[in-house]
């Protein structure tokens, strides 16, 4: 149990203890949410105190202060997903429609996702906001007719499901055009449905 002497400058529990060179002893670190209010000596272990409101320490530590809580920066495109507590900093992520463009231990700057052109859609990512859009072509039988960062390819309309016949096949950028079976289709007419 700390404090105890250590000649080789290492402690038994690296996570919860630290080496104090002045006295050549191992002392307890303070748990998350606390800081060192009195340093250890040969006869007394570290004394810890709870972080004040609006401050935190995330790890077992031998810090003499707690870190100040900071809000996520909306100017940098960040939004909050979880508040700061005495044991963790504010948790941030990119706002919807944005991705992380600058990373330094955590995301510091988000930018707008690129549009995917007609005929394509953004490849689904494991984690939202992690990277810019990678646009992939619509699979067979699907279309997407806008330039958008988030539009998804939709299945072509099946004319027969509506009691209609196909006037023009769908493409990656456009839906199938349907018409009434009784109508003959003049070549210049277009549109998704001709009635």
């Amino acid at each position: 149990v700390p404090p105890y002497g250590s000649e080789n400058q290492t402690c038994r529990d690296q996570e919860k203890e630290y080496y104090e060179p002045r006295h050549r002893i191992c002392c307890s670190r303070c748990p998350p949410g606390t800081y060192v209010s009195a340093k250890c000596s040969r006869s007394r272990d570290t004394v810890c105190a709870t972080c004040a409101e609006n401050s935190y320490n995330e790890h077992w530590n031998y810090l003499t202060i707690c870190q100040l809580c900071r809000p996520c920066d909306p100017v940098m495109g960040l939004e909050e997903i979880a508040p700061c507590t005495s044991k963790r900093k504010t948790q941030c992520r990119c706002q919807p429609g944005m991705f992380c463009a600058a990373w330094a231990l955590e995301c510091t700057h988000c930018e707008l996702l690129s549009d995917c052109p007609p005929g394509t859609e953004a490849e689904l990512k494991d984690e939202v906001g992690k990277g810019n859009n990678h646009c992939v072509p619509c699979k067979a039988g699907h279309f997407q007719n806008t330039s958008s960062p988030s539009a998804r390819c939709q299945p072509h309309t099946r004319c027969e499901d509506q009691g209609l016949v196909e006037a023009a096949p769908g493409t990656a950028q456009s839906d199938t055009t349907c018409r009434n079976p009784s109508e003959s289709l003049p070549p210049e007419m277009s549109g998704t449905m001709l009635m």
Epitope: E53, P71, A82, P83, T85, S86
Partner: antibody, heavy 116, light 107 residues
Framework: QVQLVQSGAEVKKPGSSVKVSCKAS????????LHWVRQAPGQGLEWMGW????????QYNEKFKGRVTITADKSTSTAYMELSSLRSEDTAVYYC?????????WGQGTTVTVSS | DIQMTQSPSSLSASVGDRVTITCKAS??????VAWYQQKPGKAPKSLIS???YRYSGVPSRFSGSGSGTDFTLTISSLQPEDFATYFC?????????FGQGTKVEIK
């Protein structure tokens, strides 16, 4: 000591808007989040959103997005919650609360009645 | 959103009784849970934060425990002034959510 003093009761018509104020004192207004929580008659508590007066940025519960606006005036240490397109289900007591690991400090509440 | 399921919704007890209220989160919220007491016509009053930390001025008969998804508020010996409604709340992630409340009534 920390105090949050809210504006008085309001009676509003359906479709109109209401703006409730919350004047803070006893602490540095710009360094703490102020939240709004409501409670319908005989019901539980429902979190609406917060404002961080330091940068006047607000974040909202998706349920209220587009209908609620939370603002703050640093010069008077006052936060405001405006709710628009009121309906009868918005009849409730609206509370402001200062957060730190929950809500240690609450305003006294403002009763908003929506009735035609 | 994280659901906080509180039970029981109401209970009848006598002065001196030990009362236990439970709250179950729909997903892990660590110890980021607070408990409140509310009396009719009044704002909620903070009792507990970080699942078990009792606010200064709150009598020692109130205690909180739990972590992850299961939390408990215990009143060791119910006093006349404790008859009220109690709410749990998670502040682990937005949107913050509350339990539906437990009304403690006089038997």
């Amino acid at each position: 000591q920390v105090q949050l003093v809210q504006s008085g009761a309001e009676v509003k018509k359906p479709g109109s808007s209401v703006k409730v104020s919350c004047k803070a004192s006893g602490y540095t207004f710009t360094t703490y989040y102020l939240h709004w929580v409501r409670q319908a008659p005989g019901q539980g508590l429902e979190w609406m959103g917060w404002i961080y007066p330091g940068n006047v940025h607000a974040q909202y519960n998706e349920k209220f997005k587009g209908r609620v606006t939370i603002t703050a005036d640093k010069s008077t240490s006052t936060a405001y919650m405006e709710l628009s397109s009121l309906r009868s289900e918005d009849t409730a007591v609206y509370y402001c609360a200062r957060s730190w690991e929950g809500f240690p400090y609450w305003g006294q509440g403002t009763t908003v009645t929506v009735s035609s | 959103d994280i659901q906080m399921t509180q039970s029981p919704s109401s209970l009848s007890a006598s002065v001196g009784d030990r009362v236990t209220i439970t709250c179950k989160a729909s997903q892990n919220v660590g110890i980021n849970v607070a408990w409140y007491q509310q009396k009719p016509g009044k704002a909620p009053k903070s009792l507990i934060s970080s699942a078990s930390y009792r606010y200064s001025g709150v009598p020692s008969r109130f205690s909180g425990s739990g972590s992850g998804t299961d939390f408990t508020l215990t009143i060791s010996s119910l006093q006349p002034e404790d008859f009220a409604t109690y709410f749990c709340q998670q502040y682990d992630t937005y949107p913050f959510t509350f339990g539906q409340g437990t009304k403690v009534e006089i038997k």
